[in-house]
Amino acid sequence: SSPCPQAWGPPGVQYGQPGRSVKLCCPGVTAGDPVSWFRDGEPKLLQGPDSGLGHELVLAQADSTDEGTYICQTLDGALGGTVTLQLGYPPARPVVSCQAADYENFSCTWSPSQISGLPTRYLTSYRKKTVLGADSQRRSPSTGPWPCPQDPLGAARCVVHGAEFWSQYRINVTEVNPLGASTRLLDVSLQSILRPDPPQGLRVESVPGYPRRLRASWTYPASWPSQPHFLLKFRLQYRPAQHPAWSTVEPAGLEEVITDAVAGLPHAVRVSARDFLDAGTWSTWSPEAWGTPSTGTIPKEIPAWGQLHTQPEVEPQVDSPAPPRPSLQPHPRLLDHRDSV
């Protein structure tokens, strides 16, 4: 059997750090057997069999010029093996962050904090955190650890499915290379990292006969569970074309009627979502949608922007009621009953 321990990485490659002493090991001999060492393709003897170092070659203060392939030969000239030296650095603790777009799953991404220059892999796992009381300490509930399954195709991401909203989790991301391993721990609570995706399907429509009104409607993001236990609330912003400032409202549901639009001007509208009880943060804004109020009876003069909120709307002369606004109360089954267990 080979006297050389196989580090993680491709076979036949041995590793060291720049500026440090590096020992190369001849793989095809018995431990302690004297060998001769050569650089591949070079006739010059690097270290003879009488060095007293047996099957090892010692390179003091290795640098990039020492990288490459080495050949070791036994006393009778037989090939003991070839070894490729690659220099690099031990792992450093990776940078880790976690995100959640819904209240049941979260994902964590990582990146190296230093480039090692060596083949590198990442081990990812997680555990539910539990602080045990004195009376409960004799029976610890199942808290893991469990593997955090990594995305295929080498993306630096793993996903935890079926997480508990009220629990706290500890993520362990360990960077491994042939020179060692380094671990980053991160505590994660869904409540704090929850950031929904932006609402989808934003539409802005005029309200026939109402020159100061626009109706905006949207849907929950597709990533939010389709039968949610926890609802979303929304924030809507709108502004007329060429106006720099947004007006902001918090709609009661999935629709909002803007009543102070500027007649005749197109308006940009965008919407953001957040957990109903303020867990986490607001989503990014949805892509803007545009709409222009219907042409109806126009006010005699378009007011200055600062007066918009006090300007009375000129109602249509046709004696018709304002269009009904649908009830946006959530279905009773979807009401948010969060009991911290």
Epitope: S97, K129, L132, S140, P145, R170, S182, T183, L186, D187
Partner: antibody, heavy 126, light 112 residues
């Protein structure tokens, strides 16, 4: 059953050395922060030392710094406290304790000891 | 790493409340929300009552509650019971050298 069991205490002369061990069972030892706390006879609790799950970071009370070394062997689920240059004032019951700790994106912090061993007595006397 | 300051003793009758203070500095109690409280009966190991200032581990009765204002943390035991007679210690992250620090301890006596 979650358990910590200390051993290695005993009588030692001033200037002598002792190594305490703490065997953990019933939980995934390698994921937890661990520490040593001591209590001199009739006195209060004194925080002694602390170690991160991987063993890469440690902390010590000023009173033991340079004399005590905390370490762990995650493959054996065991925590150690190597004590050198022992003094009479080191006489105490030594408790091993577990901590969940708290880890932000930049640092980990000592939080609270939720599981304690039964303690082992160290007596430093001539 | 000076010990956190606690009153040496406190007492109350069964059913009453008792509050214990724990005073540190901005480098420990005031600087972090890592304050914990322990109960210790004679000859026994300490037991965790409160962690992260206000949180109770599973199995700890809600008669025990924690709070913090500035550099002082407090433990309140309401509805005092005979088995609450014990020593109580606060502890905090010490802010340097991965260090923690305990309080001086308070002996709680249940009268009558």
């Amino acid at each position: 059953e979650v358990q910590l069991l200390e051993s290695g205490g005993g009588l030692v002369q001033p200037g002598g050395s002792l190594r305490l061990s703490c065997a953990a069972s019933g939980f995934t030892f390698s994921w937890y922060f661990m520490g040593w706390v001591r209590q001199a006879p009739g006195k209060g609790l004194e925080w002694v030392s602390y170690i991160y799950p991987s063993g890469g970071s440690t902390g010590y009370a000023d009173s033991v710094k340079g004399r005590f070394t905390i370490s762990r062997d995650n493959s054996k689920n065991t925590l150690y406290l190597q004590m050198h240059s022992l003094r009479a004032e080191d006489t105490a019951v030594y408790y091993c304790a577990r901590d969940e700790g708290y880890c932000s994106s930049t640092s980990c912090y000592f939080d609270a000891f939720d599981i304690w061993g039964q303690g082992t007595m160290v007596t430093v006397s001539s | 790493q000076s010990a956190l300051t606690q009153p040496p003793s406190a007492s109350g009758s069964p059913g009453q409340s008792v509050a214990i203070s724990c005073t540190g500095t901005s480098s420990d109690v005031g600087g972090y929300n890592f304050v914990s409280w322990y109960q210790q009966h004679p000859g026994k190991a300490p037991k965790l009552l409160i962690y992260e200032v206000t949180k109770r581990p599973s199995g700890v009765p809600d008669r025990f509650s924690g709070s913090k204002a500035g550099n002082t943390a407090s433990l309140t035991v309401s509805g005092l019971q005979a088995e609450d007679e014990a020593d109580y210690y606060c502890s905090s992250y010490g802010g340097s050298n991965n260090a923690g620090v305990f309080g001086t301890g308070t002996k709680v006596t249940v009268l009558g």
